[in-house]
Amino acid sequence: VPGEAEQPAPELVEVEVGSTALLKCGLSQSQGNLSHVDWFSVHKEKRTLIFRVRQGQGQSEPGEYEQRLSLQDRGATLALTQVTPQDERIFLCQGKRPRSQEYRIQLRVYKAPEEPNIQVNPLGIPVNSKEPEEVATCVGRNGYPIPQVIWYKNGRPLKEEKNRVHIQSSQTVESSGLYTLQSILKAQLVKEDKDAQFYCELNYRLPSGNHMKESREVTVPVFYPTEKVWLEVEPVGMLKEGDRVEIRCLADGNPPPHFSISKGNPSTREAEEETTNDNGVLVLEPARKEHSGRYECQAWNLDTMISLLSEPQELLVNYVSDVRVSPAAPERQEGSSLTLTCEAESSQDLEFQWLREETDQVLERGPVLQLHDLKREAGGGYRCVASVPSIPGLNRTQLVKLAIFGPPWMAFKERKVWVKENMVLNLSCEASGHPRPTISWNVNGTASEGDQDPQRVLSTLNVLVTPELLETGVECTASNDLGKNTSILFLELVNLTTLTPDSNTTTGLSTSTASPHTRANSTSTERKLPEPESRG
């Protein structure tokens, strides 16, 4: 073509794959009549006529562009639809009159690659490798032109480094003309890289400018031998009997070595291997004082047959022994004195408390409880609590029952019971004393007796309500070696007026009368006589 050397640089038109390229013929009126133009594509320096414009009308030439070309802008612009990477070439328009002139357009095609896909080497990398080993592979599919890849470790770009870092990239052309880039990062890693985050970045260009896409971050398994083995105990802090205790063997190697946990036997001076669970954890549940001792962990690196031992760890399971109280079963006369002594052993300093069983009232802080001028009411339960103040929940208790010699003592002297004639009545009578009393009734019926505790007895009587019984009432008599005592139960027929509640009346029907310590079954009415009640 004459004068080609002086030709100006072609106009650059940038477009994304799949979109429409607008090729505007830049010939001025003086250079040619735009109503008479030929369009060519240039590929490998060969021109091919692809479109003619005559009297402003366009006509495609047969070939690869036949279906994708059309005229726009009153014939000054050729529109190329569905642009592909193969369309990246020079297009030129040539005016026919008055003089044959041409205008060149360089079409540049772009396509953003897909999100980069990163795959870590699943086999991992040993730290002692002599040359860089494959860390991860990054694949960027369907980009145009070929994107650039940059590898990052912990947010810093990686550069090629002899015998340390090697980046091996290759690309394939898809049938679409798009490129798929594959980049392999090879590196020599160190132990500190076990938590390193690697990712790849694809840099590419679009008509709008430069862009980049990042892969997800990955960590590569790094293998290094164990150098240190140690034991960890959970929970941390003071341990006590009954706790769930886990003794865990840990190592700084990857993969973890084979572990065993041993406990020193003081008598044989040998370490006896303990049975661990599948995770190599020794679980003591519940922990006992016998679990106290010196534990150590042994780890084997099966690759080298080297065995490593942890520093021993002393485990102390704190305990409180069974509490002993003396005397164990005290008996005393009224008016006498009693000294109760509490003893226990522990791995820590103990604190003692004496409490009244019935009320939980603290009577004494210390191992000795002294009781003087004992009354009948002093009989009953006394509890010694031995506890370790520095370890919440570590305590043991022992209950002792004090018996005061005396004749039977009735729970009530007199009581009124509301009844209906011909009903079967369930009556109860309670007495205490030492020695333990027995109870008898002055009427025939089915009686049963049960021990409440060593000094207390409860007798129940099932009896049919008869007119005679309504007249005489019912007596229960408690007796022991030291005397006897009686309680009277008055029976009253229920009528409508008696069911009107007042301050001293308990309403409701009952088939039983209970002692003051138990509630009545609700089928009859019970009215207490005015207090005070004789307890003689």
Epitope: P126, P225, S260, Q298
Partner: antibody, heavy 120, light 112 residues
């Protein structure tokens, strides 16, 4: 017949470096754990380094950790000991050893040794 | 670290007599699960490299004469040469592999 031949010993100044080699023959080198053991003049034997059959695991006592590196080239049936920052107390005969197939760490085969002298 | 102490440092025994070498460990070398001790004995003749004699405290290496025997458990071990021969003149070392690897200081056996 199992043969282990050490080389590379000699005189070196304190702070200097030396690389020992061990040429193995008569067995499948890549299947065995290998070690270096040394013996200072008139002193007890001292284990120096151990490497797994594939070369991925290495172990050292504290006395040489960080200064000595054991490595192997299974393709060449060779074991190496790179010794840096050498001290007078590293003076010893260095033996190349091979483990056996027992479930315990034993040095079943030994080379004749190579003498390393660290002196100014 | 586990310290290995041998006694005596040297021993002179008549040909045909029994030689006994003791080795004491600063801690037990017994693996209670497999009931084996991580202890080996080596023999080093003058001008030669050491040679493995015994492993697992009492298992004789193949090719080792049966006059050599190992015994003991836990922390105390013994190498016995039941009938000393002229070729047994050497330094004998015990070695533990319970925690890394350490040798005893050696016991020199001579003929009286």
């Amino acid at each position: 017949e199992v043969q282990l031949v050490e080389s590379g010993g000699g005189l070196v100044q304190p702070g200097g470096s030396l690389r020992l080699s061990c040429a193995a023959s008569g067995f499948t080198f890549s299947s065995y754990i290998m070690s270096w053991v040394r013996q200072a003049p008139g002193k007890r034997l001292e284990w120096v380094a151990t490497i797994s059959s594939g070369g991925s695991s290495t172990y050292y006592p504290d006395s040489v950790k960080g200064r000595f590196t054991i490595s192997r080239d299974n393709a060449k049936n060779s074991l190496y000991l790179q010794m840096n920052s050498l001290r007078a107390e590293d003076t010893a005969v260095y033996y190349c050893t091979r483990d056996d197939d027992y479930d315990v760490k034993v040095f079943a085969y030994w080379g004749q040794g190579t003498m390393v002298t660290v002196s100014s | 670290d586990i310290v290995m102490t041998q006694s005596p440092d040297s021993l002179a025994v008549s040909l045909g007599e029994r030689a006994t070498i003791n080795c004491k460990s600063s801690r037990s070398l017994l693996n209670s699960r497999i009931r084996k001790n991580y202890l080996a004995w080596y023999q080093q003749k003058p001008g030669q490299p050491p040679k493995l004699l015994i492993y697992w405290a009492s298992t004789r290496e193949s090719g080792v004469p049966d006059r050599f025997s190992g015994s003991g458990s836990g922390t105390d071990f013994t190498l016995t040469i039941s009938s000393l021969q002229a070729e047994d003149v050497a330094v004998y070392y015990c070695k533990q592999s319970y925690n890394l690897l350490t040798f005893g200081q050696g016991t020199k056996v001579e003929i009286k």
